[in-house]
Structure formats: structure tokens, C-alpha cells
């Protein structure tokens, strides 16, 4: 698997998308896990609803949310209030039984400031950027929430 880099800014939200073949992964729950070292298991952060038909419902674990568009074939992970310790190597997974297929390897990079982007001109805007050998970069920035604003409809 190639690694896709998603760059975000500390304190803001980062949205990670993992496209997949909706027919091949029909009926399968999905998960988001973190690789903490070169060896060892990928540690589960959050997974989609226990009932596959309800996979569209957003599920939270702390500041990380997951939702699955099973028809369109896109798994979306939202990291809210991104912080330096969120940086790392992650995987989008498709679950079947006790096994898990990797849909995408994702490198989450947390920058202190938009000006820290390596190709920054005057301003850094979200959008796809150039490739780093076997990786490609996406920038995903969303504004900070206003006080009292609810980020998403609360779901369990």
C-alpha cells in the first residue's frame, strides 16, 4: 500500500477520506487504527456502527469520529481539535471476522501553523499537493468551532 499524507493545523479539524470498492467490501464494518511502531499491531481507535446498515451514523471516540458511505464507497474519519500527539501512521481497515484488510495507509501530519507547510506561499489552502515518492499529500483544514457550536449531530 502507498501512504497518503494528510496535513492539518493544530487546533483545527482534519478530515481523512478512504475510498474503497463498495461491492468488494459490501456488508463489512470499517475501522481506523494507529500504528505506534515499526512492528506490532495497529491499535484500534474507532470503528463504524455495530450494525452495518447504520454505518452512516457518526461514531466518536474522544475527538475522533468515523462515518461510512457504504454506497459511495468512502470511509471518512474526522479528527477534531487536532494536536501534535495526533500525528502518526494510521490505517483505514475493512473488517471481516477477526481479520482486517487495509484500505489505505494514512500519515497524519500536524503542523503548528499554516505557514509551516513546506510549499507555502503567502497562504496555504486545502487541496491535493505533489507526491513524495510513494506518498501523496492532501491538505484538509476546517475552521475552529465557535463557542457553543455543536460539531455534528450527536450520535452513539
Amino acid at each position: 500500500h502507498n501512504t497518503t499524507v494528510f496535513q492539518g493545523v493544530a487546533g483545527q479539524s482534519l478530515q481523512v477520506s478512504c475510498p474503497y470498492d463498495s461491492m468488494k467490501h459490501w456488508g463489512r464494518r470499517k475501522a481506523w487504527c494507529r500504528q505506534l511502531g515499526e512492528k506490532g499491531p495497529c491499535q484500534r481507535v474507532v470503528s463504524t456502527h455495530n450494525l452495518w446498515l447504520l454505518s452512516f451514523l457518526r461514531r466518536w471516540n474522544g475527538s475522533t469520529a468515523i462515518t461510512d458511505d457504504t454506497l459511495g464507497g468512502t470511509l471518512t474519519i474526522t479528527l477534531r481539535n487536532l494536536q501534535p500527539h495526533d500525528a502518526g501512521l494510521y490505517q483505514c481497515q475493512s473488517l471481516h471476522g477477526s481479520e482486517a484488510d487495509t484500505l489505505r495507509k494514512v500519515l497524519v501530519e500536524v503542523l503548528a501553523d499554516p505557514l509551516d507547510h513546506r510549499d507555502a506561499g503567502d497562504l496555504w489552502f486545502p487541496g491535493e499537493s505533489e507526491s513524495f515518492e510513494d506518498a501523496h499529500v492532501e491538505h484538509s483544514i476546517s475552521r475552529s468551532l465557535l463557542e457553543g457550536e455543536i460539531p455534528f449531530p450527536p450520535t452513539s
Partner: antibody, heavy 120, light 107 residues
Amino acid sequence: EVQLQQSGPVLVKPGASVKMSCKPSGYTFTDYYMNWVKQSHGKSLEWIGSINPYTGGSSYNQKFRGKATLTVDKSSSTAYMELNSLTSEDSAVYYCARGSYYSNLGFAYWGQGTLVTVSA
Amino acid sequence: DVQLTQSPSYLTASPGETITINCRASKSISKYLAWYQEKPGKTNKLLISSGSTLQSGIPSRFSGSGSGTDFTLTISSLEPEDFAMYYCQQYSEYPFTFGSGTKLEIK
């Protein structure tokens, strides 16, 4: 065995620039963040910034923005820090320190430090 | 910026004793705190990460505790090689910051 070898001490004049290097060994260079830390004589440690060698993405302490520039050369697996417009306040020991796997959950390995002396 | 207040700044003890060093953050940093040992002529050593996780190769007499704003490094049964400078560091948010240090000297 993981080691971080830093370049030697330098004596520079006020207003000049200096570029120091940090050459790690014993691990895959692009898998771990590299941090730079300042220690003025008899004082505590100050984080300058970090760079992800895989992407070249860097983050700076606001205090050092415009003063320090972090870069990497993946072909030689070497990290660099350049300090510009030097003053006596920049006289210090500068350390490179390796972060964790694609992240910064503590600095597990440190270089021996590069002493920078700014004097006319 | 997150300020880390380390206490005491200076500590004397004898081998075999148990000592504690405190680190207080100006705001909650969850568990994202590390402890380092600094000795002349040696490279700095990471002792504890995530507030309480002992790094491999570090003797079990070193332990860390705490979360939120209050953290403690405990060294039990002090060995002669433990007399050194100790720093706490937060990596919860940018910029990463260090405590002012605690100098542990032999009595």
C-alpha cells in the same frame, strides 16, 4: 544502536548565519520526526521546532520563527538547522532529538549538541 | 504556551533513599508528559513518556505518575548514577515546553 551525530562547535560573528547538521544512524531516517532544542548556558531547554523527514513538513516554536530554518536531505539522511542574524542571545548548545514513529511522543534519542558562540 | 513548573529546583539525597520531583502544568495536558535525565558528557535520556510509561532499558526504580496538570517522577532506592539533572516536558500542544529542571545532588 541509534545514534545522532551533530556537527562541531562554531564561533561566529554577530549578524552572521550558521548551519549545523545532525546525522542519525541505526534506524530509518524518514520514519521518525527530528526535533531541535536550545540550551543556553546554565538554563533550561527550549524547543525550537520539529521536521518530518518523510514529507519535509515542519513546525516551529513562534519564538524561533524567522530565526531558525529546519531542513532535511533524504539522500544523505541528514537533518539541518540554520540560524540567521545571530546575536549574543543565540550563543547556546543546540541539540537534535529524535521523536517517535511518525510522531513526537517524547524524544527518545538526543545528539551530543553543537555549541554555538556568537562573539565579535 | 503551556508553562511547566518543576519543583524542587534543587534536591539533595543519599543513595538508597526515595525522592520525588513534581511537575505542574499551567493547563491540562492529559497524559502527554515526558521525563528526561541530563548528565555531563552523556546524551540526554528519555526516562518516562505518556506520564507513566517507563522506556525500555530504564531501571524500574524510576516511575512516573499523574495526568491533567500534576505529575510526579519518583526514584526509589537511589543509585550513585542517578544524581543528575531532571526535566519534564509536555508534548500535548505546540510549542512543546520543558520544566526549569531539578538538580539532584548527593548528600
